[in-house]
């Protein structure tokens, strides 16, 4: 899997999107997890609704939210009030039984707030994305979902 880099500004919201094949992953719940070390486990942060038909309902764990457009095949994670300690490697996963398929590997980079005039020396600045050989950078704009953008699955 290539690693996609999403950059956000400290104190703002960052939206991460993970596209997937909606037919291949039909009926599967999704999750967002944080990679603990290069070879370590991926620790679950938040998962989509327990009832797959209600995957469009946003689920929160602390400042992290997840919602799934099961028809369009896009998992969306929102990190609210982004902090330097949120920087790191994450995964979007598709769950089936006790197994999990990786939909996308994500590197979250936290940039200093340009309007924050405090000493930025203790803020974590991400390294150049080139340090990830096959990394792809996505500059994610910070905004809330608009009313009409809340995704819905089909029902049976």
């Amino acid at each position: 899997h290539n690693t996609t880099v999403f950059q956000g500004v400290a104190g703002q919201s960052l939206q991460v999107s993970c596209p997937y094949d909606s037919m291949k992953h039909w009926g599967r719940r999704k999750a967002w997890c944080r990679q603990l070390g290069e070879k370590g486990p991926c620790q679950r942060v938040v998962s989509t609704h327990n009832l797959w038909l209600l995957s469009f309902l946003r689920r929160w764990n602390g400042s992290t939210a997840i919602t799934d457009d099961t028809l369009g095949g896009t998992l969306t994670i929102t990190l609210r009030n982004l902090q330097p300690h949120d920087a790191g490697l994450y995964q979007c996963q598709s769950l089936h039984g006790s197994e999990a398929d990786t939909l996308r590997k994500v590197l979250v980079e936290v940039l200093a707030d340009p309007l924050d005039h405090r000493d930025a020396g203790d803020l974590w600045f991400p390294g150049e994305s080139e340090s990830f050989e096959d990394a792809h950078v996505e500059h994610s704009i910070s905004r809330s979902l608009l009313e009409g953008e809340i995704p819905f699955p089909p029902t049976s």
């Epitope: 609704h49 327990n50 009832l51 209600l54 469009f56 309902l57 946003r58 689920r59 929160w60 919602t67 028809l71 979902l145 009313e147 009409g148 953008e149 809340i150 995704p151 819905f152 699955p153 089909p154 029902t155 049976s156």
Partner: antibody, heavy 118, light 107 residues
Amino acid sequence: QVQLVQSGAEVKKPGSSVKVSCKASGGTFSSYAISWVRQAPGQGLEWMGGIIPISGTANYAQKFQGRVTITADESTSTAYMELSSLRSEDTAVYYCARTQEYTLFDSWGQGTLVTVSS
Amino acid sequence: EIVLTQSPATLSLSPGERATLSCRASQSVSSYLAWFQQKPGQAPRLLIYDASNRATGIPARFSGSGSGTDFTLTISSLEPEDFAVYYCQQDYHWPITFGGGTKVEIK
């Protein structure tokens, strides 16, 4: 701001059907789930079923399966709940509710009283 | 079907007092629990979702807690407008179910 406006009160005979409408304004109608909940006089709330307008298909509570039909008309931003083979126990206030983002019941209509009496 | 049992059925309190309402599920619903307030002649209003998150515009005196099978809605200091019926609701399993309600009345 989301608003749900329901049709007026109905009086029906046992064995007949009733169709209640719920018109939505604010936001994009096709992007929200609409649920129907009923409340018999002095009783609690009971989920009947719901529909995701963009897919046009509904999900029903087992208790009402075969007797209730929930539909939506995107062109008029209106959802409908039709209940057939009415009996006196169906006398209740019927509410439509729609999701904003957190639950299926973030916003509610004002309710429609359906009285079933011979 | 998951049965939600609310207690007490009626709670008689005075304005300014603390109200503690309970909702118990017949099996675990994780944190998939919401609380609603309903006043006579009105539609219910969402107060709390995901067991402990306040909905937009809900005063800080309302708080929710619990997970699994036992949940609590607390109103820290009752205002005159808080006297109403409160319902819990789960959507962890089909069908979606509501509790029988707790009426908070003026003592």
